[in-house]
């Protein structure tokens, strides 16, 4: 598999990390998060060329199927492979809590 | 999040599990694979409109966040939840060896 | 850049209360929550508690509930802590600390030393 | 509430040495860790979150590691300037709690 930062469409153009600056209201969280009022929220986007960061046996057959049956068969999918936790501050019947979601941001990013 | 048949786009249209049959030629493996002669490929297919089988909360904001900035943000992509093993019959220097591959077909498909 | 200032020291008699104020600066006041921790002379630290400052909504440890008052003046940009019916064992500094995430503190004010002393 | 336990109490390094600060939750916190450095006469600084997150400005010569109840914070070559004492945080469940620090002194 290609090197992560090797992107044969150009760089910065592959599946990578970007950062989206979102708010509660953006989020449709507005009405039950306190904290924090904005959140970075880090996904993955970009395109999965041939093998580029190519997760497991099935993003490589996908690839191969895809380059074979391109109506049929998507290219791969930029995911994350990982996440990174995040506390959010949230409205409560008595008050508010704390609670960590441990599935809300992309730590790093895979083709699937 | 919409039940996992409930397509909102019209049966079938929705991310779900397709089965492609794929030879070793198709894969490019037939110089290191010698069984099975063809294999069928289950993969995840479909598109994944708001809330669908969405994986986890990273998949809610990428649909609140892709409503808002289409351009930036890609819609949640339909991949692999879990993946059922296979074993393959493969050519080594001294003969053949039987590999199981824990990666290679999806079992079920979730939006992310 | 983000900062926080806090006022200055405070010398008390057992009973009384104290007010210690936090001014921010360098981003959006309401888009950080601010939390309240001490440090005893000699030990460690001790988180009091939290405030929201877009609408005041705070959580206390419950240790100082009842004693301890979280509020913000939003238009001042300045969030403060008042502690009653002082004891000698609340001299400490209080430090205002500003967070991003709720879960850890990323920036903190100065130090306010309270002394409680008859 | 969660106590957090930190050791040693004191530790005394030679600067290039490595340096391992542990601290022990009372039940699991997952990862919800946090590791501050805090000089005399200063406010603390926040050094690694989430038990083995990097933050901007930090040396790369601190480190954080662990989960659930033991957890790790490692100076692989200590320098004059981190001498100070070290304080575990977690954020697993209000109230916060801190640990009674570790003190790192330069030989």
């Known amino acids: 598999a290609r090197n992560g930062d090797d992107c044969p469409l150009g760089p910065g153009r592959c599946c990578r990390l970007h950062t989206v600056r979102a708010s509660l209201e953006d989020l449709g969280w507005a009405d039950w998060v306190l904290s924090p009022r904005e959140v970075q929220v880090t996904m993955c986007i970009g395109a999965c060329p041939s093998q580029f960061r190519a997760a497991n046996m099935h993003a490589q057959i996908k690839t191969s199927l895809h380059r074979l049956k391109p109506d049929t068969v998507p290219a791969p999918c930029c995911v994350p492979a990982s996440y990174n936790p995040m506390v959010l501050i949230q409205k409560t019947d008595t008050g508010v809590s704390l609670q960590t979601y441990d599935d809300l941001l992309a730590k790093d990013c895979h083709c699937i | 999040a919409r039940n996992g048949d409930d397509c909102p786009l019209g049966p079938g249209r929705c991310c779900r599990l397709h089965t492609v049959r794929a030879s070793l030629e198709d894969l490019g493996w037939a110089d290191w694979v010698l069984s099975p002669r063809e294999v069928q490929v289950t993969m995840c297919i479909g598109a994944c409109p708001s809330q669908f089988r969405a994986a986890n909360m990273h998949a809610q904001i990428k649909t609140s966040l892709h409503r808002l900035k289409p351009d930036t943000v890609p819609a949640p992509c339909c991949v692999p939840a879990s993946y059922n093993p296979m074993v393959l019959i493969q050519k080594t220097d001294t003969g053949v060896s039987l590999q199981t591959y824990d990666d290679l077909l999806a079992k079920d498909c979730h939006c992310i | 850049q983000v900062q926080l200032v806090q006022s200055g020291s405070e010398l008390k008699k057992p009973g009384a209360s104290v007010k210690v104020s936090c001014k921010a600066s360098?981003?959006?006041?309401?888009?950080?929550?601010i939390n309240w921790v001490r440090q005893a002379p000699g030990q460690g630290l001790e988180w009091i508690g939290w405030?929201?400052?877009?609408?005041?909504?705070?959580k206390y440890n419950e240790k100082f509930k009842g004693r301890a008052t979280l509020t913000v003046d939003t238009s001042a940009s300045t969030a403060y802590m008042e502690l009653s019916s002082l004891r000698s064992e609340d001299t400490a500094v209080y430090y205002c600390?500003?967070?991003?995430?709720?879960?850890?503190?990323?920036?903190w004010g100065q130090g306010t030393t309270v002394t409680v002393s008859s | 509430e969660i106590v957090l336990t930190q050791s040693p109490a004191t530790l005394s390094v030679s600067p290039g040495e490595r340096a391992t600060l542990s601290c022990r939750a009372s039940?699991?916190?997952?990862?919800?860790l946090h590791w501050y450095q805090q000089k005399p006469g200063q406010a603390p600084r926040l050094l690694i979150k989430?038990?083995?997150q990097s933050i901007s400005g930090v040396p790369d010569r601190f480190s954080g590691s662990g989960s659930g109840t033991d957890f790790t914070l490692k100076i692989s070559r200590v320098e004059a300037e981190d001498f100070g004492v070290y304080y575990c945080?977690?954020?697993?469940?209000?109230?916060?709690?801190f640990g009674g620090g570790t003190k790192v002194e330069i030989k």
């Open positions: 360098g981003y959006t006041f309401t888009s950080y929550d």
């Open positions: 405030i929201y400052p877009r609408d005041g909504i705070s």
């Open positions: 945080q977690q954020s697993n469940s209000w109230p916060y709690t």
């Open positions: 039940q699991s916190i997952s990862y919800y």
């Open positions: 989430y038990a083995s």
């Open positions: 600390a500003g967070t991003y995430d709720p879960a850890y503190f990323d920036y």
